[in-house]
Interface confidence: low
Amino acid sequence: WELTILHTNDVHSRLEQTSEDSSKCVNASRCMGGVARLFTKVQQIRRAEPNVLLLDAGDQYQGTIWFTVYKGAEVAHFMNALRYDAMALGNHEFDNGVEGLIEPLLKEAKFPILSANIKAKGPLASQISGLYLPYKVLPVGDEVVGIVGYTSKETPFLSNPGTNLVFEDEITALQPEVDKLKTLNVNKIIALGHSGFEMDKLIAQKVRGVDVVVGGHSNTFLYTGNPPSKEVPAGKYPFIVTSDDGRKVPVVQAYAFGKYLGYLKIEFDERGNVISSHGNPILLNSSIPEDPSIKADINKWRIKLDNYSTQELGKTIVYLDGSSQSCRFRECNMGNLICDAMINNNLRHTDEMFWNHVSMCILNGGGIRSPIDERNNGTITWENLAAVLPFGGTFDLVQLKGSTLKKAFEHSVHRYGQSTGEFLQVGGIHVVYDLSRKPGDRVVKLDVLCTKCRVPSYDPLKMDEVYKVILPNFLANGGDGFQMIKDELLRHDSGDQDINVVSTYISKMKVIYPAVEGRIKFS
């Protein structure tokens, strides 16, 4: 018996087609992805093949103005239109709190939404009961397939699930649910979830009875043969893991942003064992036409977005200096504003001993592309912020050793004075440079804001300490020459859309007046 699994993950609000780098589509003839194009391909496969499942491994929420405005209603609407068979909850599904998941998505989705390792407690338990499930048994042709879901247990540090959801260890939570499916005579079981490729492989290895793992969170691109675009494969598709009980378990993921549709064909024997598996992600490029009815629906929903982008978010009573002559040479107040917003967006008081789990931000000055003049009645709009942060990136959470941070700050000024983009703006950090010293030895003081303290204060950076830092995904990926960050980071979790972070902060503060206050000094 043959099953075709179509899968997406980490779509992050890319409902419309995008450029090849998943930013805003500029030249339509070269654009990719989007739900209208995805629907064309899915329908084509559904017509050609008998047993097809369309699955999503989480993080539909967060990433473009679509989510900012529609807050998840767009996800339910278009996933329903594409007739998804199941979805796993990702960490970003909790970005607007549990209510922001329940109302727009859980109550509106016409497909099961899954996670076996999230347990509700207190008053939430009855409120959310039945709205998401640990597993679902789906009829496919003449057979049944069990889908069991999982979500990153780091979600409380990455999003806003509140205090009434407990995120358990994935493997511990999955095993009893898979065992339950086995007792129900379900012998073909897919683990669908959002914990990253390393955990996906561990689930394949450790959870007895899981036949296939469909993952997300780490934006992993797997491919067999010559890859069709810019993404470099992390391994073959499917990636085969040998389980502890000797089975070959295919593990798949389909990069991110709806650029590819994962396509995996599995052949099962009559006892539900995987005999063979093969496939590849399908690049959703312009050779695949956009479905006209879905496209018309997208255009209808778009109208509200255009109106939103010119509405006032808040006011500034000071000039927001985002000029390159400031932000690439010294502390600039636009950099301070953005870093303050980045920290504010990551406030998670999960432990009495810590005022917050993260206190530090770094931001490449070259990523700040425009100032905002306060003389326009102080008005700040989404459109203004899109000029400051035009690249459609995310502000991510990483863990780095102090020694890596020190290298990053040395890199920040290694060729100081040439208006290059690597000069770092900061939050929760006081740095002093001595530019008279040779490159690589210019940081004379680097103090960081404590987290394990009731009154935050600045302490010297410890080389062997591990620190959490918020930074642009561009830096996490080694951009602007920050190779040491990419090479030495201990953990990397994708965060929220950059403009959304700053716009939310401005809306919350209502009136802003960021200063230059001695975060960056030269001795």
Partner: nanobody, 113 residues
Framework: QVKLQESGGGRVQTGGSLRLSCAAS????????MYWYRQAPGEQRQLVAL???????YYVDSVKGRFTISRDDSKNTVYLQMNDLKPEDTAVYFC???????WGQGTQVTVSS
């Protein structure tokens, strides 16, 4: 004076388990990242795992999913639970706060096939 005392080593069969302990004194334990290292005969000392003051952990690839580092700040002790042991895990295991500080005596772990 930083003092580190490792214990819990021994000889086990492949697939067996051990729990190592390291009692620390002379450091502000609760605000210190703690590390487990190991040194096989004729090789350099290598990092195995670390745990930050916040409880965040890091493991080298070769032990991921098999070893678990934990800490008890009230006892100034860090632990290393080692499951599914393999012959290549045979080494002297050391704990440390900041690499480069004085090392303890270590505890010998021998895994036989």
């Amino acid at each position: 004076q930083v003092k580190l005392q490792e214990s819990g080593g021994g000889r086990v069969q492949t697939g067996g388990s051990l729990r190592l302990s390291c009692a620390a004194s002379g450091i502000s334990f609760s605000i210190t990242t703690m590390y487990w290292y190991r040194q096989a005969p004729g090789e350099q000392r290598q990092l195995v795992a670390l745990i930050t003051d916040r409880g965040n952990t890091y493991y080298v690839d070769s032990v991921k999913g098999r070893f678990t580092i934990s800490r008890d700040d009230s006892k100034n002790t860090v632990y290393l639970q080692m499951n599914d042991l393999k012959p290549e895990d045979t080494a002297v295991y050391f704990c440390n706060s900041i690499p480069g500080n004085d090392w303890g005596q270590g505890t010998q772990v021998t895994v036989s096939s």
